[in-house]
């Protein structure tokens, strides 16, 4: 058997660090057997069999010029083997970032914090940390570890499925190369890393007869679980074309009536989502949708002035593209009585 331990990596390659002493090992001889060393393709003897170093070649303070293929020969001139030297660095701790688009699963991505120049792989696992009692801050021995399955296509990402929203997890990402291993431990809780995907299906429609109104509606992101134990709240922004500043409102449900639109101008609208108890952070904004208020056609029946302030306006139920969610969809407000002044303007 070879006296040379096979480092992780391709066969026949041995590894060292620039600026450090490097030992190359002749693979096809018995440990301690004296050998001669040559650079591949060069007749010059690098180290003779009388060096006292047996089957090893020592390179002091290796640098990039030492990289390449070496040949070792036994005393009788037989080929002891060929060795390729590759220089690089031990792993540094990778940088890890975890995110969750829903409250049941999370993913972690990683990237090297320093390039080693050597073949590298990553080992990924996680533990669940549990508290030892309601009033105790001590943590029990954590459960696990379990593997964090990596993306099959080689992306630097692994996914934990079926996570518990109230638990803490410790992620372990270990960078491994032939010169060693280095581990990053990252404590994460779903509550803090939760960031929903942006709402989908944003539509902006005019409200006939109301030149300062637009109705925006949207649906939950598809990634949010269908039977949610946790609801989302929303933030909506809108602005007229060519206007730099956004106006922001927090709608009560899956739609909002904008009552101060600029008559005749197209408006951009976008919407963002967040866990309704403020866990995590707001999603990115949805793609903008555009709508223009209707021209000021006066409705056939104009209520008397006094009624504008006292009569709640009643609208027929509007279909929504979302499945019915009684707890999420308040009765839509096509004509919101918050802004009676705008209705007076229609009469002017």
């Amino acid at each position: 058997s070879s006296p040379c331990p096979q480092a992780w990596g391709p066969p026949g390659v041995q590894y060292g660090q620039p600026g450090r002493s490097v030992k190359l090992c002749c693979p096809g001889v018995t440990a301690g057997d004296p050998v001669s060393w040559f650079r591949d393709g060069e007749p010059k003897l690098l180290q003779g069999p009388d060096s006292g170093l047996g089957h090893e070649l020592v390179l002091a303070q290796a640098d990039s010029t030492d990289e390449g293929t070496y040949i070792c020969q036994t005393l009788d001139g037989a080929l002891g083997g060929t060795v390729t030297l590759q220089l690089g660095y031990p792993p540094a701790r990778p940088v890890v970032s975890c995110q969750a688009a829903d409250y049941e699963n999370f993913s972690c991505t990683w990237s090297p914090s320093q390039i080693s120049g050597l073949p590298t792989r990553y080992l990924t696992s996680y533990r669940k940390k549990t508290v030892l009692g309601a009033d105790s801050q001590r943590r029990s021995p954590s459960t696990g570890p379990w593997p964090c399955p990596q993306d099959p296509l080689g992306a630097a990402r692994c996914v934990v499925h079926g996570a518990e929203f109230w638990s803490q997890y410790r992620i372990n990402v270990t960078e491994v190369n032939p010169l060693g291993a280095s581990t990053r431990l990252l404590d994460v809780s779903l509550q803090s890393i939760l960031r929903p995907d942006p709402p989908q299906g944003l539509r902006v429609e005019s409200v006939p007869g109301y030149p300062r109104r637009l109705r925006a509606s949207w649906t939950y992101p598809a990634s949010w679980p269908c039977q949610p134990h946790f609801l989302l709240k929303f933030r909506l922004q809108y602005r007229p074309a060519q206007h730099p500043a956004w106006s922001t409102v927090e709608p009560a449900g899956l739609e909002e009536v904008i009552t101060d639109a600029v008559a005749g101008l197209p408006h951009a609208v976008r919407v963002s989502a967040r866990d309704f108890l403020d866990a995590g952070t707001w999603s990115t904004w949805s793609p903008e949708a555009w709508g223009t208020p209707s021209t000021g056609t006066i409705p056939k029946e104009i209520p008397a002035w006094g009624q504008l302030h006292t009569q709640p306006e009643v609208e027929p139920q509007v279909d929504s593209p979302a499945p019915p969610r009684p707890s999420l969809q308040p009765h839509p407000r096509l004509l919101d009585h918050r802004d009676s002044v705008e209705q007076v303007a229609v009469l002017a």
Partner: antibody
Framework: EVQLLESGGGLVQPGGSLRLSCAAS????????MTWVRQAPGKGLEWVSS????????QYADSVKGRFTISRDNSKNTLYLQMNSLRAEDTAVYYC???????????WGRGTLVTVSS | DIQMTQSPSSLSASVGDRVTITCQAS??????LNWYQQKPGKAPKLLIY???NLQTGVPSRFSGSGSGTDFTFTISSLQPEDIATYYC?????????FGPGTKVDIK
Amino acid sequence: EVQLLESGGGLVQPGGSLRLSCAASGFTFSWYSMTWVRQAPGKGLEWVSSIVPYGDLTQYADSVKGRFTISRDNSKNTLYLQMNSLRAEDTAVYYCAKGPGWGSFDLWGRGTLVTVSS
Amino acid sequence: DIQMTQSPSSLSASVGDRVTITCQASQDINNYLNWYQQKPGKAPKLLIYDASNLQTGVPSRFSGSGSGTDFTFTISSLQPEDIATYYCQQHESQSPTFGPGTKVDIK
């Protein structure tokens, strides 16, 4: 010679923007994480932001999150810091620093002064 | 974030004296602690990395020790060129933090 050289500092009004650059030479820039650290006049050091070699992961101090953006161009051996919505408390000397790894800084630039004042 | 405290905030010592600075982390940071020297008007310089390793080219009179939450930085024999402010810095967390610094001058 191994060195980092910052540029782009200057006087800017509150709410304004500035883009700092850091030119690296003498080492393989694309192999290392890079960092911005700042120091307010007469004060201590404050980590601002870091970026990994491939540029795909970044980290920010809470005090600058959402206002500053770190980036790098490995083909130009240059690190950047885009600073928006600047505040008086952002006034400082901004240093660019190199890894090894993430969070250790073995090479520093000389710094560039950013003054935010009306 | 992990908080770092240093003591003393300043000290005066004579040339040749042994100088010790302590640094404490608000939580366990293993040995992920660095020490930097900053002279007036200059950029900081890494002296000690990972609690006890001397950075290449740094004089051997500088040393560091400790792990967990308590760390010590020592100058075995203070020299005039050591007048500076010294900072500890943790990198256990992915958001590094510095101590407030210790200003060292000569009596």
